[in-house]
């Protein structure tokens, strides 16, 4: 009898007739940048401070009428989504709000822009414990607010934003497209992505995952004891938001990128009907629906790793494209792909101080995506080691000579256009597990590191006849770091990671005969650590 | 209109005793850009967000602010510095006309300028 | 059919407690598409809400009472009690206990008071 | 808060004839208005909610009208057993009550 988007973000040991999961936020505070608010209405009395920032611009129309309850429906529906009471995710969190969106919803940049510079200057003025700001809006792709929530986000606040209500990449819209925010898109009962009317939730990579954002019950401005149900991707971000506020509650030391590792972690994998998405945004798209942690304490040990798509490179000869991980973060591996299967690898390379995944596009091709396995690694020490084409039958092959260094991820580049379409493919010898091996006109790449109980294993999954996709899976307790094919033939459009599985892909194949040439092999690197694992033994 | 014509009365009193000789002196090195929202309806032409380098201080940004008012002043143009951005951007929010703009992106400390835009409640 | 019935000292002296219990029968109180209720009632005046609570310990206060009043529930028991401190003559009337529907889950009908429980009074007198 | 005014405090009437009360309140309640009806010795009992919906089991000679600040409730043919107190209750802002209107025997 519980609402159902409450229920869906409860884990199962949590499902008694009501939801009451431990510690309600009560640690964190949550900025509000919406609508006025109805602060007096029950579900949300006393826990949310109106702040006296407000900076909005004119409402449209001469015969325009100013009504309260209209005026706060936004915010207070929001507010009540993120702390009520009795319909709210983090009961205990407390709020402050600040008007950036008129009476018809709407703001201006630069009124977001200030309100930010608000929230950085209260920080500073009065530190509290953690804060998360919720910006349940969107305009156009802005370089300045991703600028300002940029720097915000570095200094230790959490931002999480609304992916959108245009159905369309998240990626045209800020600050949606602000890779330091935590961007959200909506799901209904189903575990589907959101129609709203015409339009619905926005998708593709710069969306970091989904949230129940259809048919929300939450605080309705038209009475103080009134609900009402909204939908969108603002309900969407306040449920993560509400979460956020949970793990900062219960853990108040993570950083961004470790609440976001999190986050990650614990949604629910691959609920969400793909189809509704574009067909070229669908590898893109993170199959995620958030969740709470099962248990709040006790996920220190593990190794986690996320999934970082590039921007698209662009169809010319030269063009590449690169994935970034956060500041916090290392980047374990690096592969790409290509719709066209036209190009010529990707590479680990330095850039300001850190690793960066740079895909490289071939000449004919459409494009290629860059995609980064970016990992958390606590005292980690990683280095790439290359080794240029080799001219050998044999192939090329690289491995992590370094004492103490486990190999992570394998990438290989190459300079020709068309690699392997008439060359044998080569095939890792076996037993040596800490070393890549590629075509032997391609230059190999080798992710290596060290890291206080790091250890890794080499997984493969070949299959003789050609097929669309080959997957490989990491078992329970490791974590997939590093996703590559063997042999990199031409007809492999590229591998990537999906969770804590490795797909590569392969042209569609009744283009491809059935010779040695179409097989294909999905090689993962699967790592754990067992410093981490005792570590939080020590703790417990 | 009439409080136009005060906060030009005002802005003219303070140029006077405004060091002005600078003014049209143009920093060295990178341009400046330009960006305004690809979506059409949802542009706000007329308010303009000039971000300044990143260890720009504040008192830099006012002077910035100051400088491009009085150079706008001199071509005929009336400008409004509605705020100065410190804490998370250094830089200023400005009320002015387009055509001021390859003038402001020649300004000292520039980084960018962005056209305002709309967002809106999702 | 859901019962509401009131219990709890008839007489209680300036300066002490009250403490009522509402025992609900015929539904359960944990379920989140109510809230539960006290109003009162002095002697030929008006009603008076003094407050409500939701089955998850969520409690909800009159503004001029709030300090005076503390709404608990035992979901265990299918009860709901009311205590309300330092008490003076004025705070002699018939108390209420009542089930509001809390729109939390809008199927579960008007955001009202109803059904009531038959009211006990209580005299505050030394 | 909210202060509901009822009139008249009294009303003296006739079975079968029509009663009409008033409640006003002292600020917009939109259409969060509800009339209960309590009889000696009784417990109050909803009648109308949101302004103009009738109660379960409550007979359609009970009506409800009004929105904002101004709301009636009408008795279109008094039955014996409707003189009682009505009372008006709004939840626009929490919860508080009218006076009452005391409906007797002519």
């Known amino acids: 009898s519980i609402p159902w988007n409450l229920e869906r973000i409860t884990p199962p040991r949590y499902r008694a007739d009501e939801y009451q999961p431990p510690d309600g936020g009560s640690l964190v505070e949550v900025y509000l940048l919406d609508t006025s608010i109805q602060s007096d209405h029950r579900e949300i009395e006393g826990r949310v401070m109106v702040t006296d920032f407000e900076n909005v611009p004119e409402e449209d129309g001469t015969r325009f009428h100013r009504q309260a309850s209209k005026c706060d429906s936004h915010g207070t529906h929001l507010a009540g989504v993120v702390s009520g009471r009795d319909a709210g995710v983090a009961k205990g969190a407390s709020m402050r709000s600040l008007r950036v969106l008129n009476c018809q919803g709407k703001g201006t940049v630069s009124g977001t822009l200030i309100g930010l510079e608000f929230i950085r200057k209260s920080q500073l003025v009065q530190p509290v414990g953690p804060l998360v700001v919720l910006l349940p809006l969107a305009g156009g792709y802005s370089r300045v607010l991703n600028a300002a929530c940029q720097r915000l986000a570095r200094a230790g606040v959490v931002l999480v934003t609304a992916a959108g209500n245009f159905r369309d990449d998240a990626c045209l819209y800020s600050p949606a497209s602000a890779p330091e925010v935590i961007t959200v898109g909506a799901t209904n009962a189903q575990d589907q992505p959101v129609t709203l009317g015409t339009l619905g939730t926005n998708f593709g990579r710069c969306v970091d995952l989904f949230a129940p954002g259809e048919d929300i019950i939450g605080a309705s401005s038209d009475c103080s004891t009134c609900f009402v149900s909204q939908s969108g991707t603002s309900q969407a971000a306040a449920h993560v938001a509400g979460i956020a506020a949970m793990m900062l509650s219960a853990e108040p030391e993570l950083t961004l990128a470790e609440l976001r590792q999190r986050l990650i972690h614990f949604s629910a994998k691959d609920v969400i009907n793909e189809a509704w998405f574009p067909e070229d945004q669908r590898v893109l798209t993170p199959n995620l629906v958030a969740a709470l942690p099962p248990s709040t304490h006790g996920a220190g040990w593990q190794l986690f790793c996320r999934t970082v798509w590039s921007a698209h490179s662009g169809p010319t000869r030269m063009a590449t494209a690169v994935a970034r991980c956060a500041p916090d973060e290392e980047l374990l591996s690096c592969s790409s792909f290509s719709r066209s299967g036209k190009r010529r690898g990707e590479r680990m390379e330095a850039q300001g101080g850190k690793l960066v995944c740079r895909a490289h596009n071939a000449f004919g091709g459409e494009g290629v995506y860059a995609i980064a396995r970016c990992c958390l690694l606590p005292q980690a020490n990683c280095s790439v080691h290359t080794a240029p084409p080799a001219e050998a039958s044999m192939g090329t092959r690289v491995h992590c000579h370094q004492q103490g260094h486990v190999l992570t991820g394998c990438s290989s580049h190459w300079e020709v256009e068309d690699l392997g379409t008439h060359k044998p493919p080569v095939l890792r010898p076996r037993g040596q597990p800490n070393q890549c091996v590629g075509h032997r006109e391609a230059s190999i790449h080798a992710s290596c590191c060290h890291a206080p109980g790091l250890e890794c294993k080499v997984k493969e999954h070949g299959i003789p006849a050609p097929q669309e996709q080959v997957t490989v899976a990491c078992e329970e307790g490791w974590t997939l770091t590093g996703c590559s094919a063997l042999p990199g033939t031409s007809h492999v459009l590229g591998a990537y990671a999906v969770d804590n599985t490795c797909v590569v892909r392969s042209r569609d194949v009744s283009t491809t005969g059935s010779t040695s040439e179409g097989a294909v092999t999905a090689v993962a690197i699967c790592c754990r650590s067992r410093h981490l694992a005792q570590a939080s033994q020590e703790l417990q | 209109q009439e409080d136009e014509d005060g906060d030009y009365e005002e802005l003219v009193l303070a140029l006077r005793s405004e060091e002005d000789g600078l003014a049209e002196a143009p920093e060295h090195g990178t341009t400046a850009t330009f960006h305004r929202c690809a979506k059409d309806p949802w542009r706000l032409p007329g308010t303009y967000v000039v971000v300044l380098k990143e260890e720009t201080h504040l008192s830099q940004s006012e002077r910035t602010a100051r400088r491009l008012q009085a150079q706008a002043a001199r071509r005929g143009y009336l400008t409004k510095i509605l705020h100065v951005f410190h804490g998370l951007l250094p830089g200023f929010l400005v009320k002015m006309s387009g055509d001021l703009l390859e003038l402001a992106l020649k300004l000292p400390h520039v980084d960018y300028i962005e056209e305002d835009s709309s967002v809106f409640a999702q | 059919q859901l019962q509401l019935q009131e219990s709890g000292p008839g007489l209680v002296k300036p300066s002490e407690t009250l403490s009522l219990t509402c025992t609900v029968s015929g539904g359960s109180i944990s379920s989140s598409s109510y809230y539960w209720g006290w109003i009162r009632q002095p002697p030929g005046k008006g009603l008076e809400w003094i407050g409500s609570i939701y089955y998850s310990g969520s409690t909800y206060y009159n503004p001029s009472l709030k300090s005076r009043v503390t709404i608990s529930v035992d979901t265990s028991k299918n009860q709901f009690s009311l205590k309300l401190s330092s008490v003076t003559a004025a705070d002699t009337a018939v108390y209420y206990c009542?089930?509001?529907?809390?729109?939390?889950?809008?199927?579960?009908?008007?955001?009202?008071?109803?059904?009531w429980g038959q009211g006990t009074l209580v005299t505050v007198s030394s | 808060e909210i202060v509901l005014t009822q009139s008249p405090a009294t009303l003296s009437l006739s079975p079968g004839e029509r009663a009409t009360l008033s409640c006003r309140a002292s600020?917009?309640?939109?259409?969060?208005l509800a009339w209960y009806q309590q009889k000696p010795g009784q417990a109050p009992r909803l009648l109308i909610y949101?302004?103009?919906n009738r109660a379960t089991g409550i007979p359609a000679r009970f009506s409800g009208s009004g929105s904002g600040t101004d709301f009636t409730l009408t008795i279109s043919s008094l039955e014996p057993e409707d003189f009682a107190v009505y009372y008006c209750q709004q939840r626009r802002n929490w919860f508080t009550f009218g006076g009452g209107t005391k409906v007797e025997i002519k």
């Open positions: 949101d302004a103009s």
């Open positions: 009542a089930r509001e529907g809390s729109g939390v889950v809008p199927a579960a009908g008007p955001n009202w008071f109803d059904p």
């Open positions: 600020q917009s309640v939109s259409s969060y």
